[in-house]
């Protein structure tokens, strides 16, 4: 092909290529062209004759203006067309009548400000209609009942100010599952006008200047609908009342989307009408105050969005926004529930009370004083089979005793990004009896004592990243109750001291991240007693993170238990010179990371074993020494193997001999050094 | 199932030093720490120390600390308890013990070694 | 070093009585506390651990509670085979010592 269209299974993809007409010289047999993005200005239906197969074919941001009806007599097979961004202004009926096998047609973003006559008549297959930006005026799409498979109108960011059945009642035998009319400027609904589509599921009003009374209005011509999911975000709904969605009692809503709103007063029975829905939008509003029948009569909605609905209005303590107690007792099917970003003053002892089906809640930086957690902080829980709990970004100082006990089915438990500072006891966790996974990084410090996880011997997944982590020393290990244990993350605590038993019974450990501590003292051969194998046993680890600790040595045994071992991570410590057999056992590494150490010299019967298998090797920024005995073996294994080895070009470079300075690692020529050969 | 069969009893002499062995079954040996606790007749159960099976390392309680050393035999999954310089006080049921998988609990205890202090 | 203080020493009962003994800390031991049952010439057996939990196989008639420093045993309704002696023992910090223990005898 002369023109630079790259072709793959039978998808040619012609985009970007600054095309003034359309390629004559790709494989007759391809089934999708994209010819997006180019400089089009019309499709002669003549270039498509020798594309006959197509099914897709996107033009898109051109500047087509007029379209051949002949183009679709050339492309019978013809499901998907996309005119999207050019500039059709008119639809004549011939335009699209040979497109009969059409389900989708994207016309978005054109120039369209009315639709004469039935331009879409033939489409009986069509299931998206995409009208969005343009400048229709109307929902006129036709003067006779057709488009009877559409599932998707989309007319969003058009000039609509009214829905009138007459308009809409070509879709008399048509179900509808997405009508969007978002950012349209509507003021009216007309009576009948949604009953005049033969089922209608899904409305999206998002971006329309509603406001409650117009809501109600919407809501009314809704009853006796099929309608299942309504989208009303940023449509200027203030306040709600036990009348505002009164309409919706005669249909069986499951999706309600009132996000971007507001909202400031949630009326007792507001939905009180709608016992069929499921999945509640309520994000970023502005209520005030939560009453104890708001939310009355939502007894089967499983998700509820209330992120960032509580704001307070001022500095003022006064001004803080209020949830009654009781308030979410009616939602007896709520599954998932998010209050992540709130100003709300506090738990109060029945604020959950009645979630007898609540698996998630996040309450990431919800509260403005909940510095605390006592034994009275999540009673009203007791009753929930909570299994994932966000506490995140709370500003929490303390954990008491018995904080956790009435969670009992919680197994994810998030007290990370706090300012916890404090020995744990492990009263803690009392009560956590199916427990797997603690995450308690970045907060000011933890003291560890033998008991702080004895309660919690089901425990997978603990994180302690940087948290001053105080006593992790003692023996027995804190860490000795968790036989369970996969993954342990204590970095960034500036440990210096721990004993060879800290990990000990650890058996099923397959992730330990220990970066950016103060380890090398105890791989020293002078440390006092000898160096310390706190990995000894570790038979099933999988990733190791050791970057970032001063390691200047490493005893040779020090990985000898660590059969599994997938990946290493050495990086950014003072690694000279390691032991002959260091990486004997490592038979499974993937992945060896000893960036930025002050490795000289990789030899064949240190390095050998570890680079068998590697798929990925980083040893950017190191002193290489590029003479023979160094450097050899290395240089012959680089320019053989399959192993990725990122910025090979430019961050391996020699450092001595003087002569060598700055040059390149991999194109040292080893053809006058003898017994180099990388594989035997 | 998870046994801890002691040895026999003992009678020694003041001054002397007796070795009360405590051998494991049921699980891994290595896995668990041993404890030591006695209880001299009508009296409370006193807690004398830990091992580590897995490397020996020790925890005493300071009131015996000169006197008692306890070791183990991990070929032979056995814990021992020696106790120097007997006086007639020292006269007790010797106990060992075996943490739960809840590690703040004795859930697993030997049948006891009666060492008899006496002239 | 934390001392555990048991009272009553002993107690006399009868079958089908209400029993409680209390255990007493020097210090916080965080609810770390076990009940001990021993009868004459045995091995001590757990009764319950972290004050409060029922260890397995031991009839729901034993309970734990407390917190802190002040803890209790109670044996709801007693049965002849629950004559015996009672230990508290904490398990905060070493050394984990013992109550002088209760001896519930017969009335």
């Known amino acids: 092909s002369t023109t630079k269209c790259t072709v793959s299974h039978e998808v040619a993809d012609c985009s970007h290529l600054k095309l003034t007409q359309v390629p004559d010289d790709l494989p007759t047999n391809i089934t999708v062209l994209n010819l997006t993005h180019n400089q089009l200005r019309r499709l002669p239906a003549a270039n498509f004759t020798r594309y006959s197969q197509l099914t897709s074919l996107d033009v898109g941001f051109n500047t087509i203006s007029k379209l051949e009806p002949e183009l679709c007599q050339k492309l019978p097979m013809l499901k998907v067309l996309n005119l999207q961004h050019n500039e059709l202004s008119q639809l004549s009926d011939k335009t699209f009548a040979f497109c009969t096998n059409l389900t989708e047609l994207h016309l978005m973003s054109n120039s369209i400000q009315k639709i004469k006559n039935n331009p879409f008549v033939k489409q009986k297959n069509l299931i998206t209609l995409d009208l969005s930006h343009n400048g229709l005026s109307s929902t006129k799409l036709g003067t006779q009942v057709q488009l009877e498979n559409l599932q998707e109108l989309l007319l969003s960011n058009n000039k609509i100010q009214a829905l009138k059945s007459e308009e809409l009642d070509i879709f008399a035998n048509s179900s509808l599952k997405k009508l969007e009319l978002s950012s349209n400027q509507i003021k009216e609904f007309s009576p009948g006008c949604f009953h005049a589509i033969g089922r209608l599921f899904g409305l999206f009003l998002n971006n329309v200047q509603l406001g409650p009374s117009l809501t109600e209005k919407l809501c009314l011509e809704l009853a006796n609908t099929s309608i299942r999911n309504l989208s009303l975000s940023n449509s200027q709904l203030s306040t709600t009342s036990n009348t505002t969605f009164l309409g919706l009692k005669w249909t069986n809503l499951t999706m309600l989307d009132l996000s971007y709103n507001n909202l400031n007063v949630v009326g007792n029975d507001s939905f009180a009408w709608l016992p069929q829905l499921e999945y509640f939008f309520l994000e970023y509003n502005n209520i005030q105050h939560l009453f104890s029948h708001s939310l009355h009569g939502l007894f089967n909605v499983r998700y509820l969005n209330l992120k960032r609905s509580f704001t307070k209005q001022s500095i003022s303590l006064a001004s803080l926004p209020k949830i009654d107690d009781f308030s979410f007792q009616w939602l007896k099917c709520l599954e998932h529930l998010n209050m992540e970003d709130n100003d709300i003053p506090g738990i109060k002892s029945n604020m959950f009370t009645g979630l007898i089906n609540l698996k998630y809640l996040s309450l990431s930086n919800s509260f403005t004083s909940l510095r605390t957690l006592t034994n009275e902080t999540f009673v009203s829980l007791a009753h929930s089979p909570l299994h994932i709990l966000n506490l995140t970004k709370n500003k929490i100082s303390k954990i008491e005793s018995d904080a956790f006990s009435w969670l009992g089915h919680l197994e994810v438990l998030d007290l990370g990004l706090n300012e916890i500072g404090q020995e744990l006891t492990g009263q803690e966790w009392r009560g956590l009896e199916n427990i797997f996974e603690i995450y308690l990084s970045y907060n000011k410090y933890l003291q560890l004592t033998r008991n702080s996880f004895a309660l919690v011997p089901s425990l997978q997944r603990l994180m302690l990243r940087r948290v001053a982590l105080k006593n992790v020393d003692s023996s027995p290990s804190p860490f000795q109750p968790l036989r369970n244990l996969t993954i342990l993350d204590l970095s960034n605590n500036n440990i210096a001291n721990i004993n060879d038993d800290m990990l000990e019974g650890l058996e099923k450990l397959e992730i330990l991240d220990l970066q950016h501590n103060n380890l090398a003292r105890l791989w020293k051969h002078a440390n006092p007693g000898g160096p310390i194998y706190f990995l000894k046993g570790l038979s099933h680890l999988h990733i190791l993170n050791l970057e970032s600790n001063g390691f200047d040595e490493i005893p040779v045994e020090v990985f000898k238990d660590l059969f599994e071992l997938k990946i290493i991570d050495l990086g950014l410590n003072n690694l000279n010179t390691l032991p002959a057999s260091v990486f004997n056992n490592q038979v499974s590494l993937k992945s060896l990371n000893l960036q930025k150490n002050l490795i000289t010299s990789v030899e064949k019967k240190v390095f050998g074993p570890a680079f068998r298998n590697l798929t990925e090797l980083d040893m950017r920024f190191n002193p290489f020494d590029c003479t023979c005995e160094s450097i050899a073996w290395f240089v012959n294994w680089i320019n053989e193997t399959h192993t990725n080895i990122p910025e090979l070009s430019s961050h391996y470079l020699c450092n001595t001999p003087p002569h060598y300075h700055g040059f390149p690692v991999r194109l040292f020529d080893t053809s006058s050094c003898k017994d180099s050969a990388p594989f035997e | 199932q998870v046994q801890l069969v002691q040895s026999g009893a003992e009678v020694k002499k003041p001054g002397a030093s007796v070795k009360v062995s405590c051998k494991a079954s049921?699980?891994?040996?290595?896995?668990?720490?041993i404890h030591w606790v006695r209880q001299a007749p009508g009296q409370r159960l006193e807690w004398m120390g830990e091992?580590?099976?897995?490397?020996?390392?020790?925890n005493y309680n300071e009131k015996f600390k000169t006197r008692v050393t306890i070791t183990r035999d991990t070929s032979a999954s056995t814990a021992y308890m020696e106790l120097s310089s007997l006086r007639s006080e020292d006269t007790a049921v010797y106990y060992c013990?075996?943490?739960?998988?809840?590690?703040?609990?004795?859930?697993?205890w030997g049948q006891g070694t009666l060492v008899t202090v006496s002239s | 070093d934390i001392q555990m203080t048991q009272s009553p020493s002993s107690l006399s009962a009868s079958v089908g009585d209400r029993v409680t003994i209390t255990c007493r800390a020097s210090?916080?031991?965080?609810?770390?506390l076990a009940w001990y049952q021993q009868k004459p010439g045995k091995a001590p057996k757990l009764l319950i651990y972290?004050?409060?939990t029922l260890a397995d196989g031991v009839p729901s008639r034993f309970s734990g509670s407390g917190s802190g420093t002040d803890f209790t045993l109670t044996i709801s309704s007693l049965q002849p085979e629950d004559f015996a002696t009672y230990y508290c023992?904490?398990?905060?910090?070493?050394?984990?010592?013992f109550g002088q223990g209760t001896k519930l005898e017969i009335k």
């Open positions: 210090g916080n031991i965080h609810n770390y």
């Open positions: 972290n004050a409060k």
């Open positions: 013990a075996r943490v739960g998988v809840i590690i703040t609990t004795f859930p697993y």
């Open positions: 023992q904490h398990f905060w910090s070493t050394p984990f010592t």
């Open positions: 049921g699980y891994t040996f290595t896995t668990y720490w």
């Open positions: 091992i580590n099976p897995n490397n020996g390392r020790i």
